[in-house]
Interface confidence: medium
């Protein structure tokens, strides 16, 4: 199936040009999306091209600037947030990145009623997190690991917590491992729907071992970065959840929410908090051995000023074949009765589907079913449930948006997006206004991305929000590669792959093959999305065939494929890449003497193991920031899939699955190993140990480090990295420069 046909016609060939590496590094062919910042059922904010903050009313068709670019520029603001009562805007500046989601910033409060910045009781700096209450204009913020509350922006702050301490106690923000591997947010506090209560997490990292690495900077002596970072099997953070009444915060103080007894009996995690009403909250907990999750619904007992979580409102989710959930345990979406909810989990056939839970999980009513998966529940209204899935035409790498009418019986299902722009758009996400009165659809491909606005009742398209016309015009004279998504059936396993082919691809010729791999548990690489990136350039200009393969352990094709890698990381992911390569060779257009593999992070681990598989298939390969031993990676992630590195659990496979154990096998391949020295995520230690093992085995290899760069290798390092990797591959494939 050719998804993005080349626009080459013989008459035009002389005006068409191939992609260049410069195009990719300059971001010449990047696309834009439009996500409305919804502020009501029919209004949204958007930052215009000239940096004004504009309010749009869909029903009146009117728009007006609520905040001028001049005001934004006066404090060098890069972000903003309107208070729900529309009286104030916070302006964010001095953005300073910390980890994947976290950053600190300076915040200024602008009073829209008088057109002035709020003076007096200004916010301290830098702030770790700040947010408005959902109603009115209360402010909660985190400063130096403690939480503060302001009833109004100009009021003095009320300090909620006092025990916050750098790298020790975190209030309202996650520590490193919770941020990266559990919450996937920079915050750990949650307002109740009307702003009566504020819930927050406290993380105690006192006993966690610390990862320390040098940050070279420009000084005479390097700095040492210290991060409490629990590696597999190490001591974990201790978490507690508190709720405070923000109307009278001083009267009673924060109340702790009890942990379910079956969870508290051994090491555990808090996984998410969902407010149901102002006096009902839902907490999700997870055993350290992550196959048991408990959802606990708690009610405020006014008279005792406590949160009560009766056992009858505890719902257990357990996996007998793998870990609980997909990448994370799914979160509930509550219905209007404020007790029943919709949730995605595995059905009896091992496919993730939407279930409706009214009393017990055992009595759950299955809402969707089939040999495909429901992926996200966007919104539940009184009469509709909107969700995404990969059901349509049985392509796991697609995403369409569906509506189920839950207000009528029997419920009927409608695909909202399947036939909108069928060739251009097969991978959607959505953003809904209050009560799903309107919604935006964002299509990511396979054609050029487009964002549109729709009526939530009729699904009619109202207008195009962003169609990337400039990008479309810029690509008119570019020889883009062809892309196809197909599947291989091997030993009862379906291996979906994406192949990127040179513009003048000829099946009778032989081409060098590059495998790009990620392959981590619950990931998906074969997706029907648009991209003009490094591999597009390699196909367009350098004439390579690039393939991406989703093997065992990858997502959205059922639990059999997903959980196949449980407790055995580094085995089947590698096998399936190798199997696919053999099938590609059989297709007849691959030069089997010129096959390479590359990957980043988990992909670096898989590419290293594939190179060291002893098959003789690969001439060369690249590992960027690879994991080299699961004992070096974070507890929350690693133990989810591997269990514990103890003798009575899974230590043997931890030891067997290292890259170092296969050092000898690198002798007959060209290996390029790359890592940032300030990688807080996959520590440089991983590559240092690979290099040491290769040296000890007297195996030649190439390496590049990026000083003071983290797991993303951003900025100028990106250019250097892709230039370096390009030279390496061209040399490996004997392509002239």
């Amino acid at each position: 199936i050719v998804l993005r046909p080349s626009r080459v016609h013989n008459s035009e060939e002389n005006t068409m040009r191939a992609l260049t590496l410069k195009d990719i590094l300059n971001g010449t062919f990047s696309y834009k999306t439009f996500f409305p910042n919804w502020i009501s059922g029919q209004e949204y904010l958007h930052q215009s091209a000239d940096n004004n903050i504009v309010l749009y009313n869909i029903e009146t068709g009117q728009s007006y600037t609520i905040l001028s670019n001049r005001t934004m520029k006066s404090v060098n603001a890069s972000n903003y947030g309107l208070s729900p009562d529309r009286q104030f805007v916070y302006l964010e500046s001095d953005y300073s990145k910390l980890w994947r989601y976290s950053y600190t910033a300076t915040y200024y409060i602008y009073d829209l009623s008088n057109g002035e910045f709020v003076r007096g009781n200004e916010l301290p700096r830098p702030i770790q997190y700040l947010c408005w209450s959902p109603v009115g204009s209360k402010l909660a913020y985190v400063y130096q690991n403690n939480i503060y509350l302001k009833q109004r922006p100009g009021d003095p702050p009320f300090q909620i917590t006092f025990n916050g301490r750098e790298n020790k106690i975190f209030n309202g923000i996650p520590d490193w491992v919770y941020e990266e591997e559990m919450l996937a947010t920079k915050y750990a506090l949650w307002w109740s729907p009307n702003g009566k209560f504020l819930a927050y997490a406290e993380f105690n990292d006192t006993d966690i071992p610390v990862i320390a690495y040098s940050y070279y900077g420009d000084e005479q002596y390097p700095r040492t970065i210290n991060i409490p970072y629990p590696k597999a099997g190490a001591k974990n953070p201790v978490v507690r959840i508190f709720i405070i009444d923000t109307t009278y915060p001083a009267y009673v103080g924060p109340q702790e929410v009890p942990v379910p007894a079956m969870i508290a009996s051994s090491d555990y995690y808090f996984s998410w908090l969902t407010w149901v009403t102002d006096e009902r909250v839902c907490l999700q907990w997870l055993k350290r051995v992550q196959n048991v999750s408990v959802l606990s619904i708690c009610d405020f007992r006014e008279d005792w000023q406590t949160w009560d979580c009766p056992k009858t409102q505890e719902h257990i989710e357990e996996s007998r074949t793998g870990w609980a959930g997909g990448f994370f345990v799914s979160t509930p979406v509550f219905s209007y009765d404020a007790i029943s909810y919709y949730k995605i989990f595995s059905d009896k056939d091992g496919y993730k589907h939407i279930h409706y839970i009214k009393d017990t999980v055992e009595n759950a009513i299955q809402i969707t079913s089939g040999k495909w998966e429901a992926i996200n529940i966007f919104r539940v209204t009184q009469d509709s449930l909107f969700y995404s899935s990969n059901e349509f035409e049985e392509y796991p790498g697609r995403r369409n948006i569906y509506r189920i009418s839950i207000g009528s019986y029997p419920p009927s299902k409608k695909c909202v997006t399947c036939h909108l722009r069928k060739e251009r758009c097969q991978y959607y996400t959505a953003s809904f206004s209050d009560y799903a009165k309107y919604y935006a659809l964002v299509c990511y491909g396979p054609g050029i991305p487009i964002s549109t606005l729709h009526d939530g009742r009729t699904d009619q398209e109202i207008k195009i929000l962003e169609e990337n016309k400039e990008l479309e015009n810029a690509l008119k004279n570019i020889q883009l590669p062809k892309e196809e998504i197909k599947k291989l059936e091997v030993d009862e396993i379906t291996l979906w792959y994406k192949m990127i082919l040179p513009p003048q691809f000829d099946r009778s010729k032989k081409y060098p093959l590059l495998i790009q791999v990620y392959g981590g548990p619950c990931s998906q690489s074969v997706r029907s999305v648009f991209a003009v990136n490094w591999i597009s350039y390699l196909a367009s200009k350098e004439g390579m065939v690039i393939a991406l393969v989703d093997g065992r352990g990858t997502a959205f094709q059922g639990d059999k494929l997903l959980y196949a890698v449980y407790r055995k990381l580094g085995v089947y992911e590698v096998e399936d890449q190798i199997t696919a390569v053999r099938k590609f060779i059989e297709m007849g257009f691959i030069d089997e003497k010129r096959i390479a593999i590359w990957g980043w992070s988990y992909g670096g681990y898989v590419s290293s193991l594939a190179l060291a598989s002893g098959t003789g298939l690969f001439k060369c390969g690249i590992a960027v920031a690879p994991v080299s031993s699961w004992e070096y990676y974070a507890s929350v992630y690693t133990e989810r899939f591997m269990g514990l590195p103890t003798k009575d659990d899974n230590l043997e496979h931890y030891k067997n699955s290292t890259v170092m154990a296969r050092a000898e096998y690198f002798r007959n391949v060209d290996y390029l190993l790359i890592h940032g020295t300030a990688d807080d995520n996959v520590h440089f230690q991983n590559s240092a140990q690979i290099a040491k093992a290769l040296v000890n085995a007297q195996v030649d290899f190439q390496a590049m480090w990026y000083s003071d760069q983290n797991h993303g290798l951003s900025g100028l390092s990106t250019n250097h990295l892709y230039t370096h990797m390009t030279h390496f591959l061209k040399q490996c494939f004997s392509l002239s420069d």
């Epitope: 009278y248 001083a250 009267y251 009673v252 103080g253 109340q255 702790e256 009890p258 006014e302 008279d303 005792w304 000023q305 406590t306």
Partner: nanobody, 121 residues
């Protein structure tokens, strides 16, 4: 802030009765559940009675159930503990405390200085 002052302790014979009082000052009194705790020499602090904000519900451990009664008067900002059929093992320092029970169990919340109760013949 809540300040608490206990009174009514003393020496009593086994089988006898005592009524402890706790006077509270501070505007947040009525927002807080209240409890009486006790601590015998060489032992940990234990809860003997608790009462909700409005006085609508009470809690007693098995050891004092049926013998002790907790009550409160929000208008007067007072909490009382009526102790009947006293036994030698009830001998302890009795503390009045204000706050949700989980806080009090962790020695958070607001606490009085305590009043001594001795049951002896």
């Amino acid at each position: 802030e809540v300040q608490l002052v206990e009174s009514g302790g003393g020496l009593v014979q086994p089988g006898g009765s005592l009524r402890l009082s706790c006077a509270a000052s501070g505007r947040t009194f009525s927002y807080n559940p209240m409890g009486w705790f006790r601590q015998a020499p060489g032992k940990g602090r234990e809860l003997v009675a608790a009462i909700s904000r409005t006085g609508g519900s009470t809690y007693y451990p098995d050891s004092v159930e049926g013998r002790f009664t907790i009550s409160r008067d929000n208008a007067k900002r007072m909490v009382y503990l009526q102790m009947n059929s006293l036994r030698a093992e009830d001998t302890a320092v009795y503390y009045c405390a204000a706050g949700p029970l989980w806080q009090l169990y962790r020695s958070h919340g607001y606490w009085g200085q305590g009043t001594q109760v001795t049951v002896s013949s």
